[in-house]
């Protein structure tokens, strides 16, 4: 019989003759994988295809962000008959193929995770040679990177009328809760979380008016841990300057 396949994702039309029912193109990826920053993650991806015993050249590709158009983070190519997929691209040298594409496995290991790796990834396989065909996962796998809090900046800045304010910025996932403590603040002061636009893992807390000299401590905490940092305010009394 004749099977005609329209691959809507690639806008290709393939017509093949088969003597028995064949596998269709499909990709199996989990919706989400979680891992901690600094650790490694595995992005599983397996596939089925209609080209039985395909032994020709193939390319395995992983993209980030969006399917079909997102930037490639990994690419390897296997020559006809070869089980070895030779890596041609590994962004920052952190992406490594675990699976064997000849055995329909494109699973990828991502090393030294950072919060910036928290995005969606899409696997793709391309056949060349006698058969020309390709397929890419539509929905991909979301890599959710978690991280204990880290205070990335703490500073004292001048504000109007010779006053001073303190800013503390921390990153983490889940986004950390920030608290200030210091002279005349009591034991601690909870700060309102304000994730910065376009920086989903960054949280900033402001202490608007530092009324006393001394040590001010910012504490960031989430379910994975806590971090703290301090600044010191010392004003030269009788002058308009300050030492921090």
């Amino acid at each position: 019989f004749v099977r005609t396949k329209i691959d809507t994702t690639e806008n290709l039309l393939n017509t093949e003759v088969h003597s028995s029912p064949a596998q269709r193109w499909s990709m199996q990826v989990p919706p989400e994988v979680s891992a901690e920053a600094g650790d490694a993650a595995v992005l599983p991806c397996t596939f089925t295809h209609p080209h039985r015993h395909y032994d020709g050249p193939l390319t395995a590709i992983w993209r980030a962000g969006e399917p079909y158009a997102g930037p490639q983070v990994f690419r390897c190519a296997a020559a006809r008959g070869s089980e070895l997929c030779q890596t041609a691209l590994s962004l920052h040298g952190r992406f490594r193929l675990l699976g064997n594409p000849r055995r329909n496995d494109l699973s990828l290991r991502v090393e030294r995770l950072a919060l910036a790796d928290d995005r969606r990834y899409f696997c793709r396989v391309e056949f060349a040679g006698d058969v020309h065909d390709r397929y890419e996962s539509r929905h991909g796998v979301r890599l959710h990177v978690t991280a204990a809090p880290r205070i990335v900046n703490i500073s004292v800045l001048p504000s109007p009328a010779h006053a001073f304010r303190a800013l503390c910025t921390a990153e983490g996932e889940p986004p950390p809760a920030l608290a200030w403590s210091g002279p005349a603040l009591g034991n601690s002061l909870a700060a309102v979380r304000s994730p910065r636009e376009g920086h989903g893992h960054l949280v900033t807390a402001e202490l608007p008016a530092l009324t006393h000299d001394g040590r001010y401590t910012c504490t960031a905490a989430n379910s994975l841990g806590r971090s703290e940092a301090s600044v010191y305010l010392f004003r030269f009394h009788g002058a308009s300057g300050a030492s921090t």
Epitope: P30, V33, A35, D39, A40, A41, V42, L43, P44, L84, Q86, T87, A88, L89, S90, G93, R96, L97, L98, G99, S107, R109
Partner: antibody, heavy 121, light 111 residues
Framework: EVQVVESGGGLVQPGGSLRLSCATS????????MNWVRQAPGKGLEWVAQ??????????FYAESLEGRFTISRDNSKSTVYLQMNSLRAEDTAVYYC????????????WGQGTLVTVSS | DIVLTQSPDSLAVSLGERATINCRAS??????????IHWYQQKPGQPPKLLIY???NLASGIPARFSGSGSGTDFTLTISSLQAEDVATYYC?????????FGQGTKVEIK
């Protein structure tokens, strides 16, 4: 046929230096990571160092206790990997094996016969 | 560092009988279903040889009487029918986290 041949072992005094070489053939050297694994006499195996390939920026990794004293390097034109060992101690006495690993897996699919390093006064 | 503990330290098995070696990791070495444990065989005076990679995959040229299983922290190497040529020391190794570490080894002998 894959071949991995170590050389450069021998007797050295404590505090001395030695450079081990590992010549390979029978495979495309550029496609693989290379490692050194050692085995003290009558003891178990201990991974020493890894050097990755060009795609992986020739990144190097070391056992923490050895970092700073040992340096792994590779010469792709000669399909050879090296281990420079400085400030040698008695506890570095071992057979040193050169091993190959795939870019996707840190397991060692081919091993050389090893070269014996003896650190003694 | 991840510590691998093999048991038993030595094992005597009759020819044709099953030999089982265990390897326990101090923390999980499995990520998303992939287990980063590998097994090697070392005969006296020879370098080690890869038997099993990623817990259960038979290396090229290794007889089917060798098999591996396990997940998380507990792994097993099984020789289904011990042959005279299987007398050796067997090591597990993890590549979940650097530094890569080995178990202390299990010596297999004929009973």
């Amino acid at each position: 046929e894959v071949q991995v041949v170590e050389s450069g072992g021998g007797l050295v005094q404590p505090g001395g230096s030695l450079r081990l070489s590992c010549a390979t053939s029978g495979f495309n050297f550029n496609d693989y990571f290379m490692n050194w694994v050692r085995q003290a006499p009558g003891k178990g195996l201990e991974w020493v160092a890894q050097i990755r390939n060009k795609i992986y920026t020739y990144a190097t990794f070391y056992a923490e206790s050895l970092e700073g004293r040992f340096t792994i390097s590779r010469d792709n034109s000669k399909s050879t990997v090296y281990l420079q060992m400085n400030s040698l101690r008695a506890e570095d006495t071992a057979v040193y094996y050169c091993t190959r690993s795939l870019t996707g897996g840190d397991y060692f699919d081919y091993w050389g016969q090893g070269t014996l390093v003896t650190v003694s006064s | 560092d991840i510590v691998l503990t093999q048991s038993p330290d030595s094992l005597a098995v009759s020819l044709g009988e099953r030999a089982t070696i265990n390897c326990r990791a101090s923390q999980s070495v499995t990520i998303s279903g992939y287990s980063f444990i590998h097994w090697y065989q070392q005969k006296p005076g020879q370098p080690p040889k890869l038997l099993i990679y990623r817990a259960s995959n038979l290396a090229s040229g290794i007889p089917a009487r060798f098999s591996g299983s396990g997940s998380g922290t507990d792994f097993t190497l099984t020789i289904s029918s011990l042959q005279a040529e299987d007398v050796a020391t067997y090591y597990c190794q993890q590549s979940r986290k650097s530094p890569w570490t080995f178990g202390q080894g299990t010596k297999v002998e004929i009973k």
